[in-house]
């Protein structure tokens, strides 16, 4: 039994780090493998993660992380019974994938303006709270070509757009994701999408 693709890990910088790897053949990850992880800190204990299957030869492990800080560094040991298959390390702050924003709401009652709001997925005392910026994806259910991305580079989790920038009388969907430049994170997953019917008063044309 050998590791074909070494574990790579990302952290939500709050509670979970996810490590994925591939074996050289079909593997029952949960019965055959264990991923041990330990904070590099005096007297820190080792924790065991039981991996789940992620495709035939793929495995995934969700590591519960202690109260994460930027200096934290973990040793990782992948075992098959008594055989050490791989040894590595992981610094959560250098491999961050933020949590997805939540509670995306489209407010359509603001005089021909669409107001999209969502919630920051971190509590105020988490380092990422004040460092997230967002991308909002809006698309038409009727027209696949009507697909747009708005970059929200300010901290407030909201976006205002004129309803007239979208077509009237059709349904749209929106979703939002986050990233933090300060930690050079990857993008979060997209939030669940929300749907609304876009309608606005066409400006009166004078002849």
């Amino acid at each position: 039994m050998k590791v074909l693709q070494e574990p790579t890990c990302v952290s939500d910088y709050m509670s979970i780090s996810t490590c994925e790897w591939k074996m050289n053949g079909p593997t029952n990850c949960s019965t055959e493998l264990r991923l041990l992880y330990q904070l590099v800190f005096l007297l820190s204990e080792a924790h065991t993660c039981i991996p789940e299957n992620n495709g035939g030869a793929g495995c995934v492990c969700h590591l519960l992380m202690d109260d994460v800080v930027s200096a934290d560094n973990y040793t990782l040991d992948l075992w098959a019974g008594q055989q050490l298959l791989w040894k590595g390390s992981f610094k959560p702050s250098e491999h961050v994938k933020p949590r997805a924003p939540g509670n995306l709401t489209v407010h359509t009652n603001v005089s021909d303006t669409l107001l999209l709001t969502w919630s920051n997925p971190y509590p105020p005392d988490n380092y990422l709270y004040n460092h997230l910026t967002y991308a909002v994806n809006i698309w038409s259910e009727n027209d696949p070509a009507d697909f747009r991305i708005y970059n929200v580079t300010y901290l407030e989790p909201s976006l205002r757009i004129a309803a007239s920038t979208l077509k009237s009388g059709i349904s749209y969907r929106a979703r939002v994701r986050a990233w933090a430049q300060c930690y050079n994170t990857t993008w979060s997953e997209w939030s669940p999408s929300t749907k609304w019917h876009n309608s606005y008063r066409e400006p009166f044309e004078q002849h």
Epitope: L43, E52, L64, D66, D67, G102, N103
Partner: antibody, heavy 120, light 107 residues
Framework: EVQLVESGGGLVKPGGSLRLSCAAS????????MNWVRQAPGKGLEWVAR??????????YYADSVKDRFTLSRDDSKNTLYLQMNSLKTEDTAVYYC???????????WGQGTTVTVSS | DIQMTQSPSSLSASVGDRVTITCSAS??????LNWYQQKPGKAPKLLIY???SLHSGVPSRFSGSGSGTDFTLTISSLQPEDFATYYC?????????FGGGTKLEIK
């Protein structure tokens, strides 16, 4: 072996005070966040409070039902967690569990609990 | 606050049965859901974290699934020691909240 041992429970009159303690052993207490969770007689579980580690400035969080009445603290040199409970109400009657937090709310070890009874 | 609703509130089953308990969140919590087991007079024990990850030392007959708002705990073949009360808990947002519990009894 991880061990959490609560103490300090007892019978107290409404408006009174109690201080619960939780002695921790078998793990690196000073790097872990800790919680208190309670369970009223015959009822479900209710999260009460959380305290983070020193590296996160001992930040505390409280359920609305206990905010401004309960105070959470820790002494890392003694591996001990404390819950100071003031202005106690009858609805605070419960078994109080000390828990280790292994990731912003995933509580992997629990003490055996200490019973607090608030009654006149 | 996020409300967690478990069903059923009680359940009778026999040793060897396959049992499913469901938990519903009042809003999307991604996969930030834990399951605990509690026996009478004892403290709860963590069974499953992050929806489907088995906590160390927990038998593989326990499994979890779901995402978003709907989650499931499954015991593939009930053992005598599994008769207990089970709680789900979200750790997406403070305050962390628990379901009302499902009491699993011997038929």
């Amino acid at each position: 072996e991880v061990q959490l041992v609560e103490s300090g429970g007892g019978l107290v009159k409404p408006g009174g005070s109690l201080r619960l303690s939780c002695a921790a052993s078998g793990f690196t207490f000073n790097t872990n966040a800790m919680n208190w969770v309670r369970q009223a007689p015959g009822k479900g579980l209710e999260w009460v409070a959380r305290i983070r580690s020193k590296s996160n400035n001992y930040a505390t969080y409280y359920a609305d039902s206990v905010k401004d009445r309960f105070t959470l603290s820790r002494d890392d040199s003694k591996n001990t967690l404390y819950l100071q409970m003031n202005s106690l109400k009858t609805e605070d009657t419960a078994v109080y569990y000390c828990t280790r937090d292994r990731g912003w709310g995933a509580m992997d070890y629990w003490g055996q609990g200490t019973t607090v009874t608030v009654s006149s | 606050d996020i409300q967690m609703t478990q069903s059923p509130s009680s359940l009778s089953a026999s040793v060897g049965d396959r049992v499913t308990i469901t938990c519903s969140a009042s809003q999307d919590i991604n996969n930030y859901l834990n399951w605990y087991q509690q026996k009478p007079g004892k403290a709860p024990k963590l069974l499953i974290y992050y929806t489907s990850s088995l906590h160390s030392g927990v038998p593989s007959r326990f499994s979890g699934s779901g995402s978003g708002t709907d989650f499931t705990l499954t015991i593939s073949s009930l053992q005598p020691e599994d008769f207990a009360t089970y709680y789900c808990q979200q750790f997406s947002n403070l305050p962390w909240t628990f379901g009302g519990g499902t009491k699993l009894e011997i038929k």
